[in-house]
């Protein structure tokens, strides 16, 4: 799917828009809000009843090159006694983000936007029970 | 910027880092993944730290619709279906990259923007601070 060109009069192309070759778009990768920091509660990944670990994936042909992925530590959830309760399930929570992919075709380079699914953390859910007929 | 490995036979004039501005193909790779979390899973209702999903819409951004999670309770749902305040529901937040039209209203000119979204909620043991 292409990025929508919104058709409202609100989106009449202003004179100040830069010229762009057909089939492509101009993308400034100097990130707005680059220095904002996540203010999540302290070490929730360890305090959660569905704890998780983080791993960093690295790809030099991707911008940003570093993407952090979470993995649930358990199949079940941790109960009040600190034991795994397999009557409940730890499940991953995922979120899409955009990255810029750099592609080498011979000596020429092209850039492609890509949607990446990131696992952000885990939550504890009641399982869906499927009964056999 | 990021250092990129180059074909050794290519001219040396190519910049090893990502340039500040790039021309990008309008088609997005992996674009067909489901962007509506209500349709992709029902974890938001089945979780012991359930959440509501609020639609955040901005036509100057791509994607224009982002779903924000808000924890339904301060406590967590226990085995009896009651809200137990011995545990706390907290949002799981994630920085994501989106496209911001720049200059505003331009159809094919964007800048990357980092935004913080609450994706869902998880149940945690609270940190208790007693008064001395």
């Amino acid at each position: 799917r292409k990025i929508p060109k919104v058709g409202h009069t609100f989106f009449q192309k202003p004179e100040s828009c830069p010229p762009v070759p057909g089939g492509s778009m101009k993308l400034d990768i100097g990130i707005i809000n680059e220095n904002q920091r996540v203010s999540m509660s302290r070490n929730i990944e360890s305090r959660s009843t569905s704890p998780w670990n983080y791993t960093v994936t690295w790809d030099p042909n991707r911008y940003p090159s570093e993407v952090v992925q979470a993995q649930c530590r358990n199949l079940g959830c941790i109960n009040a006694q600190g034991k795994e309760d397999i009557s409940m399930n730890s499940v991953p929570i995922q979120q899409e983000t955009l990255v810029v992919r750099r592609k080498h075709q011979g000596c020429s380079v092209s850039f492609q936007l890509e949607k990446v699914l990131v696992t952000v953390g885990c939550t504890c859910v009641t399982p869906v029970i499927h009964h056999v007929q | 910027g990021i250092t990129i490995p180059r074909n050794p036979g290519c001219p040396n004039s190519e910049d090893k880092n990502f340039p500040r501005t790039v021309m990008v193909n309008l088609n997005i790779h992996n674009r067909n993944t489901n962007t509506n979390p209500k349709r992709s899973s029902d974890y938001y209702n089945r979780s012991t730290s359930p959440w509501n999903l609020h639609r955040n819409e901005d036509p100057e951004r791509y994607p224009s619709v982002i779903w924000e999670a808000k924890c339904r309770h301060l406590g967590c749902i226990n085995a009896d279906g009651n809200v137990d305040y011995h545990m706390n529901s907290v949002p799981i937040q994630q920085e994501i990259l989106v496209l911001r039209r720049e200059p505003p209203h331009c159809p094919n000119s964007f800048r990357l923007e980092k935004i913080l979204v609450s994706v869902g909620c998880t149940c945690v043991t609270p940190i208790v601070h007693h008064v001395a």
Partner: antibody, heavy 121, light 112 residues
Framework: EVQLVESGGGLVQPGGSLRLSCAAS????????VHWVRQAPGKGLEWVSV???????TYNSALKSRFTISRDNSKNTLYLQMNSLRAEDTAVYYC???????????????WGQGTTVTVSS | DIVMTQSPLSLPVTPGEPASISCRSS???????????FHWYLQKPGQSPQLLIY???NRFSGVPDRFSGSGSGTDFTLKISRVEAEDVGVYYC?????????FGQGTKLEIK
């Protein structure tokens, strides 16, 4: 206009039971949490229980074994079933709406006028 | 249970003068999500309580701007910049961070 009207109070003997009602109008009970709060004569406020928009509940553990909160969405009415009543349960009982829906403040923004429960032999 | 302690319990004030009520909780009211669920209510004579301030410092709709709330953690304050005759009643602090939700014992504001 948001309105909460309590009823069902009265004189009851120790050990007896009573069911209080709170009729809500101007909003839907399946969109907001609603609390019961009581006030003994000449005393301060004491929180009793809440039923949240999704039907889950939270109780004051000191009262949970004797009091049960429930609601009927079709009547948009909240209930408090009180059993094994004691003299110390004598109070004005208020229902109060929680701000929770979409706002997530967890405060009580609209209160009923209260219904008086007297437990005496 | 969280104990909420208000002071003073009685507050005689001259109209037009400022007033201040303190409330201290026995435990921090900061939730794991970083927010503080501390509120102020006013119960006017013969009436039901009404919400004045929610989440420490936010005035509820229709509440005059002479009322302000502040504080953090365990110590909170309600200030009235210029008391008016209609402000008389009992002021209660409250917390909904921890269950059971609790109220302070109340501060009775009266006009001198």
């Amino acid at each position: 206009e948001v309105q909460l009207v309590e009823s069902g109070g009265g004189l009851v003997q120790p050990g007896g039971s009573l069911r209080l009602s709170c009729a809500a109008s101007g909003f839907s009970l399946d969109s907001y949490g609603v609390h019961w709060v009581r006030q003994a004569p000449g005393k301060g406020l004491e929180w009793v229980s809440v039923i949240w928009s999704d039907g889950t509940t939270t109780y004051n553990s000191a009262l949970k074994s004797r009091f049960t909160i429930s609601r009927d969405n079709s009547k948009n009415t909240l209930y408090l079933q009180m059993n094994s009543l004691r003299a110390e349960d004598t109070a004005v009982y208020y229902c109060a709406r929680d701000t929770h829906y979409r706002l997530y403040y967890y405060a009580m923004d609209y209160w009923g006028q209260g219904t008086t429960v007297t437990v005496s032999s | 249970d969280i104990v909420m302690t208000q002071s003073p319990l009685s507050l005689p004030v001259t109209p037009g003068e400022p007033a201040s009520i303190s409330c201290r909780s026995s435990q921090s009211l900061v939730h794991s999500n970083g927010d503080t669920y501390f509120h102020w209510y006013l119960q006017k004579p013969g009436q039901s309580p009404q919400l004045l301030i929610y989440k420490v410092s936010n005035r509820f709709s229709g509440v005059p701007d002479r009322f302000s709330g502040s504080g953090s953690g365990t110590d909170f304050t309600l200030k009235i910049s210029r008391v008016e005759a209609e402000d008389v009643g009992v002021y209660y602090c409250s917390q909904t961070t921890h269950a059971p939700f609790t109220f302070g014992q109340g501060t009775k504001l009266e006009i001198k």
